[in-house]
């Protein structure tokens, strides 16, 4: 026997208390599929969340984050504070990347510079807090007697102390 509720379209609910008639979802609620016995409560984008898409009778609201924050989690379930490039977010706020690490984004953690020597290459451009090192050709790529450019010696940034 067919369930009478299966005829209720998205945007309605099948009323348990009224002989299973299809009724529209009330304000601030929705049903995204047909045959639902209850309507879901609309998400509210409050505080640091911003409304990206309004709730309708058939779909939930979608949120993003106010400027200075970025989304985390499925469906932007959290907003996390942005930091500057060259920093990472800690419990105490934004902190500069430690020497030997970098972050080229406003989010995420500082990652170690690439170790060029592991691939048998040399450092072409030194790393900074904001940028990874750039590896160049390996020193053995230069045949004796061939003019070559001297590679910069790997070294730290002046004044940037390890912490």
């Amino acid at each position: 026997l067919q369930d009478p509720c299966s005829n209720c379209p998205a945007g309605t609910f099948c009323d348990n208390n009224r002989n299973q008639i299809c009724s529209p979802c009330p304000p601030n609620s929705f049903s995204s599929a047909g045959g639902q016995r209850t309507c879901d409560i609309c998400r509210q984008c409050k505080g640091v969340f911003r409304t990206r898409k309004e709730c309708s009778s058939t779909s939930n609201a979608e949120c993003d984050c106010t400027p200075g924050f970025h989304c985390l989690g499925a469906g932007c379930s959290m907003c996390e504070q942005d930091c500057k490039q060259g920093q990472e977010l800690t419990k105490k706020g934004c902190k500069d990347c430690c020497f030997g690490t970098f972050n080229d984004q406003k989010r995420g953690i500082c990652r170690p510079w690439t170790n060029c020597s592991l691939d048998g290459k040399s450092v072409l451009v030194n790393g900074t807090k904001e940028r990874d090192v750039v590896c160049g050709p390996s020193p053995t790529d230069f045949s004796p007697g061939t003019p070559s450019t001297t590679m910069p010696v790997p070294g730290g940034e002046p004044g940037h102390t390890s912490h």
């Epitope: 208390n17 979802c25 304000p27 209850t38 309507c39 409560i41 509210q44």
Partner: antibody, heavy 122, light 112 residues
């Protein structure tokens, strides 16, 4: 139509605990269900609700501390992720009857289970 | 989040008398009417008395009457019986995906 909670016991702080709410005479897909607790000497405190389709909504203080999930058409769970002594209480599960036909949770919580006691102590 | 403030506890009256418990909300409940009243006795689960501000729940005597709208609600118990000694709670429904429901602090009714 009835509701019954189980799983309450003595746990040490930080030990996750899952409570179960078993319903009979109706399906969880047809109603909103709520979890409410009462600490010793305190009033009733709303924890959260789950819709018929399985969407969950929590009190702001309960977010991250509790997880409501449906394991079958007749069993609902409440997980206390990292209990503290403040979570010592009787935990109740109740159906939202929606007798006025709104189509969502209205606060007409009925029936209720007898409750299950959770004691958090070191 | 909204706050529901109930009449200071306890409220006492004699058998056969009338008590009135108020529930004041800091914000209007959904539809100005989604407020329920519960009776709670020690060792027992809460019992639904009134839903949608004034609708009497099934099996509840008509001595219990709910009224009010928006932010101000009242539960009146007339012809008081000794069995009515309990703590009474109001709960409001709010248009929010967090703190969807808020309970009042409770009002103890003492029957003399």
């Amino acid at each position: 139509q009835s509701v019954e909670e189980s799983g309450g016991r003595l746990v040490t702080p930080g030990t996750p605990l899952t409570l179960t709410c078993t319903v009979s005479g109706f399906s969880l897909s047809d109603y909103y269900m709520t979890w409410v607790r009462q600490a010793p000497g305190k009033g009733l405190e709303y924890i959260g609700i789950m819709s018929g389709s399985g969407s969950t909504y929590y009190a702001s203080w309960a977010k991250g501390r509790f997880t409501i999930s449906k394991t079958s058409s007749t069993t609902l769970e409440l997980k206390i992720t990292s209990p503290t002594t403040e979570d010592t209480a009787i935990y109740f599960c109740a159906r939202d009857g929606d007798y006025a036909g709104w189509g969502y949770a209205t606060g007409a919580f009925d029936p209720w289970g007898p409750g299950t006691l959770v004691t958090v102590s070191s | 989040a909204a706050v529901l403030t109930q009449t200071p506890s306890p409220v006492s009256a004699a058998v056969g008398g009338t008590v009135t418990i108020s529930c004041q909300a800091s914000q209007s409940v959904v539809g100005n009417s989604l407020l329920s009243w519960f009776q709670k006795k020690p060792g027992q689960p809460p019992k639904l008395l009134i839903y949608s501000a004034s609708s009497l729940a099934s099996g509840v005597p008509s001595r219990f009457k709910g009224s009010g709208s928006g932010t101000q609600f009242t539960l009146t118990i007339s012809d008081l019986e000794s069995d009515d000694a309990a703590t009474y709670y109001c709960t409001g429904r709010y248009n929010s995906d967090t703190d969807t429901f808020v309970f009042g602090g409770g009002t103890e009714v003492v029957v003399k």
